[in-house]
Interface confidence: medium
């Protein structure tokens, strides 16, 4: 229904706390360089204005759209051009073009320092002094680094952060309590960020239809007892919600997400038997719980999918009369039977089925033509299964760090033109798939591995799009989203690449490496490994092992030396010489 004042409507629905959090996220995602203090001032002004509209919906400007109100606020920032350059040009446009312009200027890799977690004592002090400001800083710092983070989910993580700090800051050993708990929240949030970026990419590049297909497959896996029209309703709602968040309509997105949670909890009987525990929780936790819900049990004695989609003589008639509905029903029926498949795989199978019908229904004997379609799925299913098997075996053999290095070598050979920091980030993330998925039961491995890899590769594509350097990467990134992972997997050593010349300074290290945290040390070593591969793309595994082993020993030896600087200065050149020789 239409409301006189959109902003008053959202303020009333969301409540002041969530309203303020979402406005802060919105501003932080649009203007990623502004300091917290500047954003919080704008948030307060918007909140005060919303309150005047709640009191009187006919008050001046209360009838304006939220985009107009937010955009006017952003465009009134002094020195906007000095800080943001051409983003300031957006302010000359009218809505909705102005908002589109802001969206286009979101930076997936902003030039911001990595978010440093303060020391435990300092963290607890500032949290206890002003919890609201502390959590506000958290929202701001995450949102500006991840401009597509799913806003209502970020509010949930802030709530989790709050819970952890409330609990741990009363403990005697605060650090021991905080570190593992905050690490777990951080890990989940980072995965959530890449997953949501993938959803927004899907929406931006391929539109709502593609996203809705993804949602139908996912919902059908989770809720195999729900009927197709129920799944369609849920998928339509989820598509709308994601479109809003990806489009910067964060208040509407969060409001609609809460509405969907309410609907699901009121209609559990027709959706899933697993929802009750989620439905007893408060709103943010309820929505998050529903988003992560375990799969319901598959109904017993489901008939073979062949009956309706292969053996039925009316397949072509049904397909011709309502293509999207028929294909949607196929996707639903296949997905509800296969919680053990990735969504990407299910969408590839649906695409194959569609292509088969397009071809066969135009022929003389359609049933004879499409009769073998299910058998033709086999190679499409085997490919990701083999990928999971070989990669999990490698992970089990090498451990996470070793597996990351293997992936780094592989991807540097596939796309040596890509910048080393981007390759290292991608390989570290891709390598985490082992820890995340390979320890799961067999039936959960494939969906975990492939859907996670797809999200990480989307991040690689998004970064590469900004500064395209590799034709192969561009080719894989330009195609359909569901074909990306197989496309990257199929890439081999780039034969067109002219090896980088050997620069001694790339492999020169100093004593500062000794005091770095383990993660930073790993990144230094992985940076060196990528550079080695760029220098010698066809180096054998044994050659690389020798050089990297030598390098690790060198670092270890010099970090234990009495005169570290001297050791690095004298031993470093020897290491470089030995490395060149080993790779010759």
């Amino acid at each position: 229904e239409a409301h006189k004042s959109e902003i008053a409507h959202r303020f009333k629905d969301l409540g002041e706390q969530h309203f303020k959090g979402l406005v802060l996220i919105a501003f932080s995602q649009y203007l990623q360089k502004c300091p917290y203090e500047e954003h919080i001032k704008l948030v307060q002004e918007v909140t005060d204005f919303a309150k005047t509209c709640v009191a009187d919906e006919n008050a001046e400007n209360c009838d304006k759209s939220i985009h107009t109100l937010f955009g006017d606020k952003l465009c009134a920032i002094p020195k906007l051009r000095d800080n943001y350059g051409e983003l300031a040009d957006c302010c000359a446009k009218q809505e909705p073009e102005r908002n589109e312009c802001f969206l286009q200027h979101k930076d997936d890799n902003p030039n911001l320092p990595p978010f440093q977690r303060p020391e435990a004592e300092a963290m607890c002090t500032s949290f206890q002094e002003n919890p609201t400001s502390f959590l506000g800083h958290y929202l701001h710092e995450v949102a500006r680094r991840h401009p597509y983070f799913y806003a209502p989910e970020l509010l949930y993580y802030a709530e989790k952060y709050n819970e952890v700090l409330t609990q741990c800051c009363t403990e005697s050993d605060k650090a021991a309590c905080l570190t593992p708990k905050l690490d777990a929240v951080k890990e989940k949030a980072l995965v959530a960020a890449v997953r949501q970026r993938m959803k927004c990419s899907s929406m931006q590049r391929f539109g709502e239809r593609a996203f809705k297909a993804w949602a139908v497959a996912r919902m059908s896996q989770r809720f195999p007892n729900a009927e197709f029209a129920e799944i369609t309703k849920l998928a339509t709602d989820v598509t709308k919600i994601n479109k809003e968040c990806c489009h910067g309509d964060l208040l509407e997105c969060a409001d609609d997400r809460a509405e969907l949670a309410k609907y699901m909890c009121e209609n559990q009987a027709t959706i899933s038997s697993k929802l009750q525990a989620c439905c007893d929780k408060p709103v943010l936790q309820k929505s998050q719980c529903l988003a992560e819900i375990e799969h319901d049990n598959i109904p017993a004695d489901l008939p073979s999918i062949a009956a309706d989609f292969v053996e039925d003589k009316e397949v072509c008639k049904n397909y011709a009369e309502a293509k999207d509905v028929f294909l949607g029903t196929f996707l639903y029926e296949y997905s509800r039977r296969h919680p053990d498949y990735s969504v990407s795989l299910l969408l590839r199978l649906a695409k194959k089925y569609e292509a088969t019908l397009e071809k066969c229904c135009a022929e003389g004997d359609p049933p004879a033509c499409y009769g073998t379609v299910l058998a033709e799925f086999q190679p499409l299913v085997e490919e990701p299964k083999n990928l999971v098997k070989t990669n999990c075996e490698l992970y089990e053999k090498l451990g996470e760090y070793g597996f990351q290095n293997a992936v780094l070598v592989r991807y540097t050979q596939k796309a040596p033109q890509v910048s080393t920091p981007t390759l290292v980030e991608a390989a570290r993330n891709l390598g985490r798939v082992g820890t995340k998925c390979c320890t799961l039961p067999e039936a959960q491995r494939l969906p975990c591995v492939e859907d996670y890899l797809s999200a990480i590769l989307n991040r690689l594509c998004v970064l590469h799009e900004k500064t395209p350097v590799s034709e192969k990467v561009t080719k894989c990134c330009s195609g359909s989203l569901v074909e990306r992972r197989p496309c990257f997997s199929a890439l081999t050593v780039d034969e067109t690449y002219v090896p980088k010349e050997f620069k001694a300074e790339t492999f020169t290290f100093h004593s500062d490496i000794c005091t770095l945290p383990d993660k930073e040390k790993q990144i230094k070593k992985q940076t060196a490994l990528a550079e080695l591969v760029k220098h010698k793309p066809k180096a054998t595994e044994d050659q690389l092992k020798t050089v990297m082993g030598d390098f690790a020993q060198f670092v270890d030896k010099c970090c234990k030396a009495a005169d570290k600087d001297n050791c690095f200065a004298t031993e470093g050149p020897n290491l470089v010489a030995r490395s060149k020789e080993a790779l010759a």
């Epitope: 009927e227 008939p303 309706d308 028929f326 949607g328």
Partner: nanobody, 126 residues
Amino acid sequence: EVQLVESGGGLVQPGGSLRLSCAASGRTFIAYAMGWFRQAPGKGLEFVSAITNFAGGTTYYADSVKGRFTISRDNSKNTLYLQMNSLRAEDTAVYYCAADRSAQTMRQVRPVLPYWGQGTLVTVSS
């Protein structure tokens, strides 16, 4: 949008049989669960039977008709059927066909289902 038109009603003797049909126009018949309801003279609306969106889908029946009535659908003809055997006087009613998102919710006889037909009268009398 789905438009529904019932047919097949009429006068039948106790113990006799009738087959009701419900023809749907609109391109999304396959997306909907379908059901039959009835309203006896001077009584409220009563759930009779429902079927999920596929031809071989799950079926639901009211206890009063279990074993006597059979619901089925032919998606290629966009048609829903109700085969009624061993009819009794108490089966006399106007029979309505309806479409909804879920066959399970249909059993709750919500007064506002998305799509209803106009109804066909079944009279069981000797």
